[in-house]
């Protein structure tokens, strides 16, 4: 048993039929010694008396809020949550496996630049009685500070018969140098509590590996005289690290017809302009990627040919 | 410890091309190592991230762009002395700071070159003959060092009398390639910045 926060404790249980459970000793937080009684939840049924209460925790019915009283007055509470371990593996019932980039990916994180700010998100099909808290650090043995905000519900989607809820959190490394070479990964830890079930999820990454620039901005077309060609120009996204001559991007320019089956013409360039042939009803899209470290491409910025 | 913004020179940057080749070569070599050593811990998640240049050079700090010198988190640099007669910029306007930066890059390359050559010698003794260092990568390191054109004492190749542990050597190779790729990215950024300055 360990303390998650004040008056909230997590009991780790091997979860299998007829498991013996865990013996837990609760102590009433009071200077009083005599006349103390214990109840579970809002029940008036007395479970025991004395400053300590010993219980065998086997299932969710044994979890909940234990309260010690004296003469009708509440002295203290202890909320017990369960963390299930089945076949040696901690349960992952609360969050959905996103399966990207690999199986058992529950947390996904992205950064728009090298400033040390990043966003993580996760999915669940649970919509009520759910709380998350997020902690992060650079490295684990001698952790350096990363500050995370509160997790918030960022999107709701319908997936077949199910509704899916996306939560996200923003974190910022306390003292980040954009030019630094990372040798210790960022660790992100999410505590998830659904009712009386506790689970924790972790992710470990280097900022350089989760970079995904915003799409190029100010995408414009300039027709070239007496030609079907156009000059496409764009700018670095505002959110990208500066100076741009140090944090350089490379770009992919695509000409795509109305039909998905039509052949796509693609050009790769380090410049912020390109000359392409603009077909009728086609659209021109540009996306960006770090020029030197191949992390994710940005989403496309698009403009119609006409 | 920052790069001044110099006026562009007509005889600009022979090093940019070489640094781009270097990044391409080390990335290809790392990919090859990951594929060939698929049953070894060779991915970024599996290896320990070690920097053989730590406390010997300070390339990141010495080559910091002017715009980042206001960022206090970037300025916890280590004092290191460098030989400062580089000739990568065709012009004679190479400032002390830029020379410090380029000589730091040169020292990095020299250290990695020695490590890679030592390692290759061990790998050539492996009866499995599973993996060797790409000669192209070693050549590209050499070319960039020549383009930087610093005079520096040659570091003797480390030789070892004991029988090499090939498993350890291959893991060390992965560690070295990951670290060198990260340094090659920094070098490329620096050269791009200098080229634009």
């Amino acid at each position: 048993i360990w303390e998650l926060k004040k008056d909230v404790y997590v009991v780790e249980l091997d979860w299998y039929p007829d498991a013996p459970g865990e013996m837990v000793v609760l102590t009433c937080d009071t200077p009083e010694e005599d006349g103390i009684t214990w109840t579970l939840d809002q029940s008036s049924e007395v479970l025991g008396s004395g400053k300590t209460l010993t219980i065998q925790v086997k299932e969710f019915g044994d979890a909940g809020q234990y309260t010690c009283h004296k003469g009708g007055e509440v002295l203290s509470h202890s909320l017990l949550l369960l963390h299930k371990k089945e076949d040696g593996i901690w349960s992952t019932d609360i969050l959905k496996d996103q399966k990207e980039p690999k199986n058992k990916t529950f947390l996904r994180c992205e950064a728009k630049n090298y400033s040390g700010r990043f966003t993580c998100w996760w999915l669940t099909t649970i919509s009520t009685d759910l709380t998350f808290s997020v902690k992060s650090s650079r490295g684990s043995s001698d952790p350096q500070g990363v500050t995370c905000g509160a997790a918030t519900l960022s999107a709701e989607r319908v997936r077949g018969d199910n509704k899916e809820y996306e939560y996200s959190v923003e974190c910022q490394e306390d003292s980040a140098c954009p030019a630094a070479e990372e040798s210790l990964p960022i660790e992100v830890m999410v505590d998830a509590v659904h009712k009386l079930k506790y689970e924790n999820y972790t992710s470990s990454f280097f900022i350089r590996d989760i970079i995904k620039p915003d799409p190029p901005k100010n995408l414009q077309l300039k027709p070239l005289k007496n030609s079907r060609q156009v000059e496409v120009s764009w700018e670095y996204p505002d959110t990208w690290s500066t100076p741009h001559s140090y944090f350089s991007l490379t770009f992919c320019v695509q000409v795509q017809g109305k039909s998905k089956r039509e052949k796509k013409d693609r050009v790769f360039t380090d410049k912020t302009s390109a000359t392409v042939i603009c077909r009728k009803n086609a659209s021109i899209s540009v996306r960006a990627q770090d020029r030197y470290y191949s992390s994710s491409w940005s989403e496309w910025a698009s403009v119609p040919c006409s | 410890r920052n790069l001044p913004v110099a006026t562009p020179d007509p005889g600009m940057f022979p090093c940019l091309h070489h640094s781009q080749n270097l990044l391409r070569a080390v990335s290809n070599m790392l990919q090859k190592a990951r594929q060939t050593l698929e049953f070894y811990p060779c991915t970024s998640e599996e290896i320990d991230h070690e920097d053989i240049t730590k406390d010997k050079t300070s390339t990141v700090e010495a080559c910091l762009p002017l715009e980042l010198t206001k960022n206090e988190s970037c300025l916890n640099s280590r004092e290191t002395s460098f030989i400062t007669n580089g000739s990568c910029l065709a012009s004679r306007k190479t400032s002390f700071m830029m020379a410090l930066c380029l000589s730091s890059i040169y020292e990095d390359l020299k250290m990695y070159q020695v490590e890679f050559k030592t390692m290759n010698a061990k790998l050539l003794m492996d009866p499995k003959r599973q993996i060797f260092l790409d000669q192209n990568m070693l050549a590209v390191i050499d070319e960039l060092m020549q383009a930087l054109n610093f005079n520096s004492e040659t570091v003797p190749q480390k030789s070892s009398l004991e029988e090499p542990d090939f498993y350890k050597t291959k893991i060390k190779l992965c560690i070295l390639l990951h670290a060198f790729r990260i340094r090659a990215v920094t070098i490329d950024r620096v050269m791009s910045y200098l080229n634009a300055s």
């Epitope: 579970l40 939840d41 809020q65 009685d129 009712k195 009386l196 079930k197 | -």
Partner: antibody
Framework: EVTLKESGPVLVKPTETLTLTCTVS??????????VSWIRQPPGKALEWLAH???????YYNPSLKSRLTISKDTSKSQVVLTMTNMDPVDTATYYC????????????WGQGTTVTVSS | SVVMTQTPKFLLVSAGDRVTITCKAS??????VAWFQQKPGQSPKLLIY???NRYTGVPDRFTGSGYGTDFTFTISTVQAEDLAVYFC?????????FGGGTKLEIK
């Protein structure tokens, strides 16, 4: 002793707004982990959950009725109020309030219910 | 929303019989299922929470089991006072939903 008691009009006209009050005793609406739900039951039919409010004001609504419902509480009066706009004859039902706590997460105490008929 | 399909709708049994009611959720609801008893003219009473936990003061002839999508409620030895409608309810997901109910009648 924990008790909940619903009160409100017996009859409402179509399109009118229904306001129901749940007055609780034996526990405080401001106690951490305390919550109250509203549930209704049309004559001879199954139960339907409408809305829930927690001690800290956080609330949940049944999405199919969300646009018509508002749940609120007045801790000093130990009351939880549910308003339902644009009433229709199909909303004729017995309306219950029930306590649901963040300890056993079950509706462990129910009021006796108040019957509301929607008719012109 | 999660549909709780409760079977059977009606049960006619003799005192002393064993009774089993099932509830099937349209998607997994973990163990977040409660069972209620509603006697004629009364409000519902909580019997079981977390699928298998008997609420305070509930006789031990009432038991619940199940996880995921399939849940069972059992009265081991029916007594005359058990005449009531029994409902299952999930609160894994909003909207919290109830089964259609099982009316238990005693011969």
């Amino acid at each position: 002793e924990v008790t909940l008691k619903e009160s409100g009009p017996v009859l409402v006209k179509p399109t009118e707004t229904l306001t129901l009050t749940c007055t609780v005793s034996g526990f405080s609406l401001s106690t951490s982990g305390m919550g109250v739900s509203w549930i209704r039951q049309p004559p001879g039919k199954a139960l339907e959950w409408l809305a829930h409010i927690w001690w800290d004001g956080d609330n949940y609504y049944n999405p199919s009725l969300k646009s018509r419902l508002t749940i609120s509480k007045d801790t000093s009066k130990s009351q939880v109020v549910l308003t339902m706009t644009n009433m229709d004859p199909v909303d004729t039902a017995t309306y219950y309030c029930a306590r649901r706590t963040r300890v056993n997460y079950a509706m462990d105490y129910w009021g006796q219910g108040t019957t509301v008929t929607v008719s012109s | 929303s999660v549909v709780m399909t409760q079977t059977p709708k009606f049960l006619l049994v003799s005192a002393g019989d064993r009774v089993t009611i099932t509830c099937k959720a349209s998607q997994s609801v973990s163990n977040d299922v409660a069972w209620f008893q509603q006697k004629p003219g009364q409000s519902p009473k909580l019997l079981i929470y977390y699928a298998s936990n008997r609420y305070t003061g509930v006789p031990d002839r009432f038991t619940g089991s199940g996880y995921g999508t399939d849940f069972t409620f059992t009265i081991s030895t029916v007594q005359a006072e058990d005449l009531a409608v029994y409902f299952c309810q999930q609160d894994y997901n909003s909207p919290w939903t109830f089964g259609g109910g099982t009316k238990l009648e005693i011969k």
